[in-house]
Interface confidence: low
């Protein structure tokens, strides 16, 4: 199921999904002066089987001034590796997108794509946070947020990250000192009875799926 709202906002921080769970949708948005072709998809959908996940549908933009010109769609796999996706994309990532079961990698850009991507996340999606340039992490903890299902309602866990205005910038897990991205986190149903004795944020994934609209700057 789709997540109802956006991941939490943290002052002076940005977030990014390193891989997208099956069921995630990405709006086919075109930049100013362009529009979706009439027969084109409204969104791309992450789908897959037990061994492979990929984005279904293709986004196509055409000039608003012309009716016949359709623009090139999804690049080939070779091009995907070379393309820089967002400003938050890091050289080292906490997970190998291609090998994470049930997840799609960052969709490659399409020609005349809008500068902003609008994702619709599903329950169990995790996003990672980092302080923007010129700020550093004052409080280190799980710099991540997970969309959980609790009592039939979706919510995002609160990342334990506070960014302070100093020169050193924090990085994504795996780049510098990991904020905290434990491996092998189980996807389990969230119990209504919370019995944890620690005040730390719980970031377990929910196994059920329910959407959030999230926008990310696209360079």
């Amino acid at each position: 199921e789709l997540c109802d709202d956006d991941p939490p906002e943290i002052p002076h921080a940005t977030f990014k999904a390193m891989a997208y769970k099956e069921g995630t949708m990405l709006n086919c948005e075109c930049k100013r002066g362009f529009r979706r072709i009439k027969s084109g998809s409204l969104y791309m959908l992450c789908t897959g089987n037990s061994s492979h996940s990929s984005w279904d549908n293709q986004c196509q933009c055409t000039s608003s001034a012309t009716r016949n010109t359709t623009k090139q769609v999804t690049p080939q796999p070779e091009e995907q590796k070379e393309r820089k996706t967002t400003e938050m994309q890091s050289p080292m990532q906490p997970v190998d997108q291609a090998s994470l079961p049930g997840h799609c990698r960052e969709p490659p850009p399409w020609e005349n794509e809008a500068t902003e991507r609008i994702y619709h996340f599903v329950v169990g999606q995790m996003v990672y946070y980092q302080c923007v340039q010129g700020y550093r992490a004052l409080h280190r903890g799980p710099a991540e947020s997970v969309c959980k299902m609790t009592h039939g309602k979706t919510r995002w866990t609160q990342p334990q990250l506070i960014c302070t205005g100093e020169m050193e910038t924090s990085q994504f897990p795996g780049e510098e000192k990991p904020q905290a991205s434990p491996e092998g986190r189980p996807e389990s149903e969230t119990s209504c009875l919370v019995t944890t004795t620690d005040f730390q944020i719980q970031t377990e994934m929910a196994a059920t799926m329910e959407t959030s609209i999230f926008t990310t700057e696209y360079q």
């Epitope: 906002e9 919510r155 609160q158 334990q160 919370v194 719980q202």
Partner: nanobody
């Protein structure tokens, strides 16, 4: 062990004021959204007010808007509820609660969405 301890309750006449305090200990307070709930005799626990961890968002129940003010001091691990123009219908046990839900202006938090609770403090407003 996470602990939330409320204080500041008491008996006050209608139209009077009280300031409730909630002290948090045992963990990371400043990344938690905090809320106040209350339970009047024979009634369900109801949402009163909430404040996000970075104090960017504050939510109030319609019944207390303009009269109650929620605030927090992250340095002291404290949350406060300033209650003015109290009415007899404000009589209840007031509970402090902590959770990690990112608040939004269109949400009214419910008790099930809060993970940690204090024992409560009694507020009695006489007419």
């Amino acid at each position: 062990q996470v602990q939330l301890v409320e204080s500041g309750g008491g008996l006050v006449q209608a139209g009077g004021s009280l300031r409730l305090s909630c002290a948090a200990s045992g963990g990371t307070f400043r990344t938690r959204n905090m809320g106040w709930f209350r339970r009047a005799p024979g009634k369900e626990r109801e949402f009163v007010a909430a404040v996000s961890w970075n104090v960017d968002n504050k939510l109030y129940a319609d019944s207390v808007k303009g009269r109650f003010t929620i605030s927090r001091d992250n340095g002291r691990n404290m949350v406060y509820l300033q209650m003015n123009s109290l009415k007899p219908e404000d009589t209840a046990v007031y509970y402090c609660a902590a959770d990690n839900i990112p608040l939004s202006s269109d949400m009214r938090p419910t008790a099930t969405e809060y993970d940690y609770w204090g024992q409560g403090t009694q507020v009695t407003v006489s007419s």
